[in-house]
Amino acid sequence: MMTGTIETTGNISAEKGGSIILQCHLSSTTAQVTQVNWEQQDQLLAICNADLGWHISPSFKDRVAPGPGLGLTLQSLTVNDTGEYFCIYHTYPDGTYTGRIFLEVLESSVAEHGARFQIP
């Protein structure tokens, strides 16, 4: 029986050109997490695998950073980034848990800001 639950950052907004942290947290299960996938609609953004570490999809390499933790940071946001994002936890023996986040990228300066990065 799948007893776990996923808590997400829910519906969030961010400013165009800024950055945002997407986070999911799996709790209430002793199942072993083997992989976490981050997807935007049907596009794979990133994977964190127990044995292989992080893999960022080539098309998002310049704008996606892993972390903090198992979260994902989106940078240089555009209005086209508005939409649904999914965290998919692969666990053993429970199976798959999925969390949903809706991101709205705003033109105004009312939105939240994510983490700041230094890129060499």
Epitope: H25, S27, G53, W54, A65
Partner: antibody
Framework: QVQLQQPGSELVRPGASVKLSCKAS????????MHWVKQRHGQGLEWIGN????????NYDEKFKNKGTLTVDTSSSTAYMHLSSLTSEDSAVYYC??????????WGQGTTLTVSS | DIVLTQSPATLSVTPGDSVSLSCRAS??????LHWFQQKSHESPRLLIN???QSISGIPSRFRGSGSGTDFTLIINSLETEDFGMYFC?????????FGGGTKLEIK
């Protein structure tokens, strides 16, 4: 198997700088965060910062922003921390630690840095 | 920055006892809390990740629980090899932070 190799000790003069190394093996270096942690004698652990070798992205604790600089050499799978303007307060054990799906799952043995004239 | 407060600072116990170590966060960190053991002159060792996830190779007497701001590490039937320092650490947001530690010593 995963290994993070650090020199055992470094002795430097006050005011000088030092570059501590952490050589990784047994895994894909560019796919995991590398963190640096400070521990003064018999005290707690302090997070200095991290670097993602795949992109060079870094994060620092504000306290260490003007003290340490993190870099990597992906060709040799080595992470470095450059510490400048050293004082006796910088004398400590410095650890590197890998973070993946299972948090800080592997640690180096630590480098004991002694700042003394 | 998120501050992690560990209590007690020191715990004197007898082998065979069971103990609870506490770690409290200054704000919610969901379940992004990890526990480490450190023995004298050794590197820290990961015991529990994400509040309650067991780690391969770590004895089952180590158990973690909690979410949000309050977390507990329970060690059942203490063995002599369990004495040392225990630290909690959060990875909910940068900068990552550690608790001040709990020293587990033999009574």
């Amino acid at each position: 198997q995963v290994q993070l190799q650090q020199p055992g000790s470094e002795l430097v003069r006050p005011g000088a700088s030092v570059k501590l190394s952490c050589k990784a093996s047994g895994y894909t270096f560019t796919s995991y965060w590398m963190h640096w942690v400070k521990q003064r004698h018999g005290q707690g652990l302090e997070w200095i910062g991290n670097i993602f070798p795949g992109s060079g992205i870094t994060n620092y604790d504000e306290k260490f922003k003007n003290k340490g600089t993190l870099t990597v050499d992906t060709s040799s799978s080595t992470a470095y921390m450059h510490l400048s303007s050293l004082t006796s307060e910088d004398s400590a054990v410095y650890y590197c630690a890998r973070e993946g799906l299972y948090a800080f799952d592997y640690w180096g043995q630590g480098t004991t840095l002694t700042v003394s004239s | 920055d998120i501050v992690l407060t560990q209590s007690p600072a020191t715990l004197s116990v007898t082998p065979g006892d069971s103990v609870s170590l506490s770690c409290r966060a200054s704000q919610s960190i969901r379940n992004s809390l990890h526990w480490f053991q450190q023995k004298s002159h050794e590197s820290p060792r990961l015991l529990i990740n994400y509040a309650s996830q067991s780690i391969s190779g770590i004895p089952s007497r180590f158990r973690g629980s909690g979410s949000g701001t309050d977390f507990t590490l329970i060690i059942n039937s203490l063995e002599t090899e369990d004495f040392g320092m225990y630290f909690c650490q959060q990875s909910n947001s940068w900068p990552y932070t550690f608790g001040g530690g709990t020293k587990l010593e033999i009574k």
